[in-house]
């Protein structure tokens, strides 16, 4: 029991979660492609979720998608429309801590 407690303590001591760069606001044109980048690092590797206007982002085949990257996560929106305007937020967690960043797409 003592040794397992020590291992657990070491894991907790080494865990971290950092927002490496705040998300930028993005201005683009109708029909273009926008990319929003969530730049976070952590241990354990963080889980990242995307929100638009405080609601989970709805992925759309061939138009709106997000995926993990070496720096965190990237949200890509193709064929932009005015209706895509809004607040985009990424929320990252490593199970212990939570960090988030918000950008506005105009």
């Amino acid at each position: 029991p003592t040794s397992s407690w020590n291992i657990s303590s070491e894991l907790n001591k080494d865990s971290y979660l950092t927002l490496d760069e705040p998300m930028n606001n993005i201005t683009t044109s109708l029909g273009q492609t926008a990319e929003l980048h969530c730049k976070v690092s952590g241990n354990p590797p963080p889980t990242i979720r995307w929100f638009k206007n405080d609601a989970p982002v709805v992925q759309e085949p061939r138009r709106l998608s997000f995926r993990s990257t070496i720096y965190g996560s990237r949200l890509r929106i193709r064929n932009l429309d005015t209706t895509d305007t809004g607040y985009f937020q990424c929320v990252a967690t490593n199970g212990k801590e939570v960090v988030s960043s918000t950008g506005v797409l105009f």
Epitope: N53, D54, A55, V58, T82, D84, G86, F106
Partner: antibody, heavy 119, light 107 residues
Framework: EVQLVESGGGLVQPGGSLRLSCAAS????????IHWVRQAPGKGLEWVAA????????YYADSVKGRFTISADTSKNTAYLQMNSLRAEDTAVYYC????????????WGQGTLVTVSS | DIQMTQSPSSLSASVGDRVTITCRAS??????VAWYQQKPGKAPKLLIY???SLYSGVPSRFSGSRSGTDFTLTISSLQPEDFATYYC?????????FGQGTKVEIK
């Protein structure tokens, strides 16, 4: 305390102009979308226009595009709706409203100002 | 354009009744739906946001729920001050779309 106060409504003839004001206080004005929403007598709510004051980004409903202009003065914490070529169907109570900090719906509304377009 | 189809357009109920109003979105709006209450001559007031979150200061008899693209506002026990018109709104797709409204009248 967050407050939005509209003014500038009144009676105007068809083809005339009017400028509405929305004075904001109690929050960082430039960092929120400010919208104008109208309600014709006995009818539902209709979105009219929006602006993000910090960048001057503007958006319009098709029904008012080319006739109405939304603007904002961040030094005065005030949004404006310039209404030209007014029509009878523009008769309504006009509300300004704030989108929440994460875009979470219209969390604050003004009291409204009545615009009547009639000869 | 995204449509929010609200029903019923009006209903009659008594104090103490449980009242349910529904809105159906024409496409996915995630959980970005709000409900507002409006009384004659007054501005709308936010009741529910994010489909089911109760806005600050709103009585707990009001609740919201979501099932796919169907959204429901429930008043568990209607009070005299609840007689008003209620609107749903999606705000996932800018600039948002309102339902047609539901007038709750005294039976």
């Amino acid at each position: 305390e967050v407050q939005l106060v509209e003014s500038g409504g009144g009676l105007v003839q068809p083809g005339g102009s009017l400028r509405l004001s929305c004075a904001a206080s109690g929050f960082t004005f430039g960092s929120y979308f400010i919208h104008w929403v109208r309600q014709a007598p006995g009818k539902g709510l209709e979105w009219v226009a929006a602006i993000f004051p910090a960048g001057g980004y503007t958006y319009y409903a098709d029904s008012v595009k080319g006739r109405f202009t939304i603007s904002a003065d961040t030094s005065k914490n005030t949004a404006y709706l310039q209404m030209n070529s007014l029509r009878a169907e523009d008769t309504a109570v006009y509300y300004c409203a704030r989108y929440g900090s994460m875009g979470g719906a219209f969390d604050y509304w003004g009291q409204g100002t009545l615009v009547t377009v009639s000869s | 354009d995204i449509q929010m189809t609200q029903s019923p357009s009006s209903l009659s109920a008594s104090v103490g009744d449980r009242v349910t109003i529904t809105c159906r979105a024409s496409q996915s709006v995630s959980s970005a739906v709000a409900w507002y209450q409006q009384k004659p001559g007054k501005a709308p007031k936010l009741l529910i946001y994010s489909a089911s979150s109760l806005y600050s200061g709103v009585p707990s008899r009001f609740s919201g729920s979501r099932s796919g693209t169907d959204f429901t506002l429930t008043i568990s026990s209607l009070q005299p001050e609840d007689f008003a018109t209620y609107y749903c709104q999606q705000y996932y797709w800018f600039p948002g779309t309102f339902g047609q409204g539901t007038k709750v009248e005294i039976k």
